[in-house]
């Protein structure tokens, strides 16, 4: 997260880190005791999932292995549409005040809605500085029409943009797959943006979760 702030401790109990060994690979969101939602481009052979702590590499955090993941069947490595994936945990999480599932959206929030994005991604770009604490940034949803002025045809129909005019605050390397939460519901998953990160008026681009609720529910049901 560029130009963000340290999240209030325990305020993101659904936030997870997808680790490769002990190294941050992507963010993710707990949606069920067995399931984490993340970006399709975060796919690996297997994952170590850290839950229940704002500190990356926290020894007291829950760590659960995940060996199965299900990309959206329409994910394209060319256009990056449908950049969404479900990761099935090998064992269920122990829910607590520190570990909770996020609320999936009932509807798509409109442009102008205030949201918070979080992650352990680099706080500087292009040179990287990875924080140990979970970082947050407050952003607003931007209309597709406005966002297309920047990204033109790169912006797919199920992509969502968020940012703050003239501000550098944005997501960056390592934040991928992490949550954009608006009015206590998951509205976006970090997908992409311009690079170096934090260029003013280049919004962050997210997978618009409200368009995928049916796929999420059906996939979890199928692979119970």
């Amino acid at each position: 997260i560029i130009d963000g702030y340290k999240c209030k401790e325990g305020s993101h109990p659904w936030q997870v880190a997808l680790l490769k060994g002990n190294q941050l690979h992507c963010g993710g969101v707990l949606v069920d005791k067995y399931w984490v939602l993340t970006a399709a481009h975060c796919k690996m052979g297997q994952y170590q999932v850290q839950l229940g702590s704002d500190k990356i590499g926290d020894q007291s955090a829950q760590k659960i292995k995940a060996t199965k993941s299900f990309r959206h069947p329409g994910y394209s490595t060319k256009t990056h549409v449908n950049d969404i994936m479900l990761v099935r945990l090998d064992e269920p999480v122990k829910m607590s005040s520190k570990v909770e599932a996020v609320q999936l959206p009932e509807h798509c929030e409109p442009p102008g809605t205030s949201c918070t994005v979080s992650g352990w991604g680099t706080t500087t770009s292009p040179d990287v500085t990875f924080p140990s604490d979970l970082m947050c940034s407050d952003v607003k949803l931007i209309s597709s029409r406005e966002c297309k002025k920047v990204y033109k045809d790169l912006l797919g129909k199920t992509m969502l943009c968020a940012g703050i005019p003239d501000s550098k605050t944005n997501t960056c390397n390592g934040d991928s797959g992490g949550p954009l939460v608006c009015n206590d519901t998951l509205q976006g998953l970090v997908s992409w943006g311009t690079y170096p990160c934090g260029q003013p008026n280049d919004p962050g681009v997210y997978t618009q979760v409200c368009k995928y609720k049916r796929w999420v529910m059906e996939t979890m049901k199928t692979h119970r």
Epitope: K20, Q23, H25, A39, A40, H41, C42, K43, M44, T77, K78, H80, D83, G121, S125, P126, Y151, K152, D153, L154, T171, C172, N173, G174, D175, S176, V190, S191, W192, G193, T194, Y195, C197, V205
Partner: antibody, heavy 122, light 108 residues
Amino acid sequence: QVQLVQSGAEVKKPGASVKVSCKASGYTFTSEGIHWVRQAPGQGLEWMGSISASSGDTNYAQKLQGRVTMTTDTSTSTAYMELRSLRSDDTAVYYCARAAGYGARSWYFDLWGQGTMVTVSS
Amino acid sequence: DIQMTQSPSSLSASVGDRVTITCRASQSISSYLNWYQQKPGKAPKLLIYGASSLQSGVPSRFSGSGSGTDFTLTISSLQPEDFATYYCDQFYSTPPITFGGGTKVEIK
């Protein structure tokens, strides 16, 4: 030191295969994509394809589809490019390059290997 | 696929000259164009990304401009070490990534 180091020059007969390696150091290999670009003697640059070091996702140039395979070994931070059924017009310097970006998209090549000369001759 | 056309294919110039190279895309690529310098026997080196942003460590005599389909690389005062071949590429509609044919800058 952030670098990509490629394997040495190769001489191959038409119809043979070649496998070029590209070892990354000084950065997190799985965080960026590796692309392969070739340059025939006295010619311009030609994009061959790319691979995501973490997911293994590949995209290949249409003209090379079926003849090229790109792989990675994350345990050694090494990318490989294999080209089969070699022809004389595959004679070129082959470069690996790191694509800079974040998330699903990359925007430019900010780091290149030193190149590997592959000569195809009977 | 988007085609990238560079002009001129070669030019002769003297030290101190202002040199301009152009790159034209077959369709709009917004500002997702990059410029590279390549010297004989060496790998290309990034000069400019995003049409106009100077890569770290690249001298300020290099500048880029343009958006949409027409782009320019300018060397404000040519130095002896600038004699090389220059390439543009586009990362807008990818894959494939497409390169311009190159512009060779030679000593007059």
